[in-house]
C-alpha cells in the first residue's frame, strides 16, 4: 500500500496555466509531474478556485473548464492527490492567476439585466423558433462622458457582438437588442454577457455576468384569444404562446375584470379554455398570460398579459388576434 509507505512522495503538477478561452470562460491546464515515481498509480488532482468565487473539486483529467465572470480576475491552485478507502495523500499546491483587466471599478456598467423572448426563426425550415435577447444597463458612476460601451454574448461556443443599441442623452450605449440569437432557452447552459468600454479619458473596466436562460426567458402572451358570450356564459379560448415548448408545457392565468363593479376574477388553469358565468349588464375585460410549467422545465415566471378583450353590454362578442 503506497499510502502507508513512509518514503512515498506526491509531487505537484507542472506547467499549470490559466487561459481565457471565451467570454467568462477559462481553461485550466497542467501536466503530471514527470519526476513522479509510481506513475502507474491512480493519481487525481484537487482543484481549488480562489477567485472570483471559491470552489473546489477533484478530477482525473489534466484540464478543467470554468465558466465565471473574469472582470475581477481569476486565481486557482491545483495539487496531486492519491485516494484510498481510509486516507488521502496530497502534494503541495501550485497556483496561477489571470490579472483583473485595467480600469477603475466605478467605470464599468451596473444593473445589467437581460431577457429573452421566443421569436419566429428566419430559417423556419431548419428551426421554427429562435430567441431574441435584450439587455439594459446603467452607465458606471465614474465613467467619463465620452465613454462608449460594447456588449457581447456567448452561448456555448458561439459569440456575437451587439449591432443594435439604445443610447442615453450623452449618446452612450445603455441597451442592446439581438433580434435573433444562438441561445436555446430550453437548455441548461449558461449565457455569458460581457460589456467592455472605451474612453479617451480613462480605462473602462469591463463587466461579465452569467444568466440562466431559463431564469431570463420571458414567455410570450398567449395567442388568438377568443371570447364568446352565450346565455350568461363567457366562453374564453386561446392558443399557446409562440414557443418551442409544446402545448402541455404551459400553465395559464386568466383575468376577468368587471368594469362596472371593479371585481377581478383570477383563475389558474392548465387548459387553454375557460367558461365563466356573467351578468348581462356589465362589460368585461379579459386577459391571459402563460408560464412554462414543471413537466417541461423548472417553472418559470409568468409572461406578459395578452391585450385586453372587452365584451358584454353593447359589445356582444369580440375576437382579438395577435
Amino acid at each position: 500500500d503506497l499510502l502507508n509507505h513512509k518514503k512515498f512522495l506526491l509531487l505537484p503538477p507542472v506547467n499549470f496555466t490559466i487561459k481565457a478561452t471565451g467570454l467568462a470562460q477559462v481553461l485550466l491546464h497542467w501536466d503530471p509531474n514527470p519526476d513522479q515515481e509510481q506513475r502507474h498509480v491512480d493519481l487525481e488532482y484537487h482543484v481549488k478556485i480562489n477567485a472570483p468565487q471559491e470552489d473546489e473539486y477533484d478530477t482525473r483529467k489534466t484540464e478543467s473548464k470554468c465558466v465565471t465572470p473574469l472582470h475581477e480576475g481569476f486565481a486557482a491552485s491545483v495539487r496531486t492527490i492519491l485516494k484510498s478507502s481510509h486516507t488521502t495523500l496530497a502534494s503541495s499546491w501550485v497556483s496561477a492567476e489571470l490579472k483583473a483587466p485595467p480600469g477603475s471599478p466605478g467605470t464599468s456598467v451596473t444593473n445589467l439585466t437581460c431577457t429573452t423572448h421566443t421569436v419566429v426563426s428566419s430559417h423556419t425550415h431548419l428551426r421554427p423558433y429562435q430567441v431574441s435577447l435584450r439587455c439594459t444597463w446603467l452607465v458606471g458612476k465614474d465613467a467619463p462622458e465620452d465613454t462608449q460601451y460594447f456588449l457581447y454574448y456567448r452561448f456555448g461556443v458561439l459569440t456575437e457582438k451587439c449591432q443594435e443599441y439604445s443610447r442615453d442623452a450623452l449618446n452612450r450605449n445603455t441597451a442592446c437588442w439581438f433580434p435573433r440569437t444562438f441561445i436555446n432557452s430550453k437548455g441548461f447552459e449558461q449565457l455569458a454577457v460581457h460589456i467592455n468600454g472605451s474612453s479617451k479619458r480613462a480605462a473602462i473596466k469591463p463587466f461579465d455576468q452569467l444568466f440562466s436562460p431559463l431564469a431570463i426567458d420571458q414567455v410570450n402572451p398567449p395567442r388568438n384569444v377568443t371570447v364568446e358570450i352565450e346565455s350568461n356564459s363567457l366562453y374564453i379560448q386561446w392558443e399557446k404562446p409562440l414557443s418551442a415548448f409544446p402545448d402541455h408545457c404551459f400553465n395559464y392565468e386568466l383575468k376577468i375584470y368587471n368594469t362596472k363593479n371593479g371585481h377581478i376574477q383570477k383563475e389558474k388553469l392548465i387548459a387553454n379554455k375557460f367558461i365563466s358565468k356573467i351578468d348581462d349588464v356589465s362589460t368585461y375585460s379579459i386577459q391571459v398570460r402563460a408560464a412554462v410549467s414543471s413537466p417541461c422545465r423548472m417553472p418559470g415566471r409568468w409572461g406578459e398579459w395578452s391585450q385586453p378583450i372587452y365584451v358584454g353590454k353593447e359589445r356582444k362578442s369580440l375576437v382579438e388576434w395577435h
Epitope: H248, I270, A271, K273, F274, P295, C296
Partner: antibody, heavy 124, light 107 residues
Framework: EVQLQQSGAELGKPGTSVKLSCKVS????????IHWVNQRPGKGLEWIGR????????IYAEKFKNKATLTADTSSNTAYMQLSQLKSDDTAIYFC?????????????????WGQGASVTVSS | DIQMTQSPASLSASLGETVTIECRTS??????LAWYQQKPGKSPQLLIY???SLHTGVPSRFSGSGSGTQYSLKINSLQSEDVASYCC?????????FGSGTKLEIK
C-alpha cells in the same frame, strides 16, 4: 360524476358509412376536447383525432384524415364520429375520451374519462 | 409523427414482485407522457400523466419516471387485480401516439 355514453354496436357493409355518438353528462364539452381512439381485435390503442367542441375544430391523425369526420353538438353535449368508405380493417372498438378538470391534475391533452366503447364490424 | 417503442410485449411475474415497463420515444416529448391500464373487455384507465404524476385514485404502488425520450412504469408489490394490458401515450405533439402495449399476467 362525468360519464361518456357511447352509441351501440354497428354492423356496416364495405363502402358504406357509420356514425357513432358520445354523449357526455356531468361536464360541459365546450370546456374540453373530445378524443377518439380505436382498438382493432387483439391490437393496441390508436389515436384517431380530437375535436374542440367550442369551435368545432378537429385534428386528425394522418391515416384517418379521409376516414373519420369529427363533429360536436354543444346543445346536446354530444360528440360524433362518422367513418366513411368502410373496409374490413375498420372493424374495431371505437372509444371516445376526454379530459375533465382545469386547475389541477392532467392537462386537456390527457384522457382521464372514457366511454365504454362502441364495436364496429364491417362485413359483406 | 412521434414513434413509441414499448417493451416488453408481454410480461409474467409473481404476486408481490416488482415489474417495470419501458417506453421509448423517437424524440424528446418533454414529459408529455401518460400510462394507461386496460383490463380485458374494458375501457382504458389513466394511471400516470406528465411522466411521473399519479392520477387521482390510482394506488401508490404504481409510479412513473423518465425524461427526454426514455420513460418507464413501475408496479411495486404486484397484486392479482393488476393483470391487464398497459400502454404509454405521448401528448407532446399531434398526432398523439400510443405504445404497442404490454400484457401483464401472473405466474
Amino acid at each position: 360524476e362525468v360519464q361518456l355514453q357511447q352509441s351501440g354496436a354497428e354492423l356496416g357493409k364495405p363502402g358504406t358509412s357509420v356514425k357513432l355518438s358520445c354523449k357526455v353528462s356531468g361536464y360541459n364539452i365546450k370546456n374540453t376536447y373530445i378524443h377518439w381512439v380505436n382498438q382493432r381485435p387483439g391490437k393496441g390503442l390508436e389515436w384517431i383525432g380530437r375535436i374542440d367542441p367550442a369551435n368545432g375544430n378537429p385534428i386528425y391523425a394522418e391515416k384517418f384524415k379521409n376516414k373519420a369526420t369529427l363533429t360536436a353538438d354543444t346543445s346536446s353535449n354530444t360528440a360524433y364520429m362518422q367513418l366513411s368508405q368502410l373496409k374490413s380493417d375498420d372493424t374495431a372498438i371505437y372509444f371516445c375520451a376526454m379530459h375533465r378538470g382545469h386547475s389541477m391534475g392532467p392537462g386537456p391533452y390527457v384522457m382521464d374519462a372514457w366511454g365504454q366503447g362502441a364495436s364496429v364490424t364491417v362485413s359483406s | 409523427d412521434i414513434q413509441m417503442t414499448q417493451s416488453p410485449a408481454s410480461l409474467s411475474a409473481s404476486l408481490g414482485e416488482t415489474v417495470t415497463i419501458e417506453c421509448r420515444t423517437s424524440e424528446d416529448i418533454y414529459n408529455g407522457l401518460a400510462w394507461y391500464q386496460q383490463k380485458p373487455g374494458k375501457s382504458p384507465q389513466l394511471l400516470i400523466y406528465n411522466a411521473n404524476s399519479l392520477h387521482t385514485g390510482v394506488p401508490s404502488r404504481f409510479s412513473g419516471s423518465g425524461s427526454g425520450t426514455q420513460y418507464s412504469l413501475k408496479i411495486n408489490s404486484l397484486q392479482s387485480e393488476d393483470v391487464a394490458s398497459y400502454c404509454c401515450q405521448q401528448y407532446s405533439n399531434y398526432p398523439f401516439t400510443f405504445g404497442s402495449g404490454t400484457k401483464l399476467e401472473i405466474k
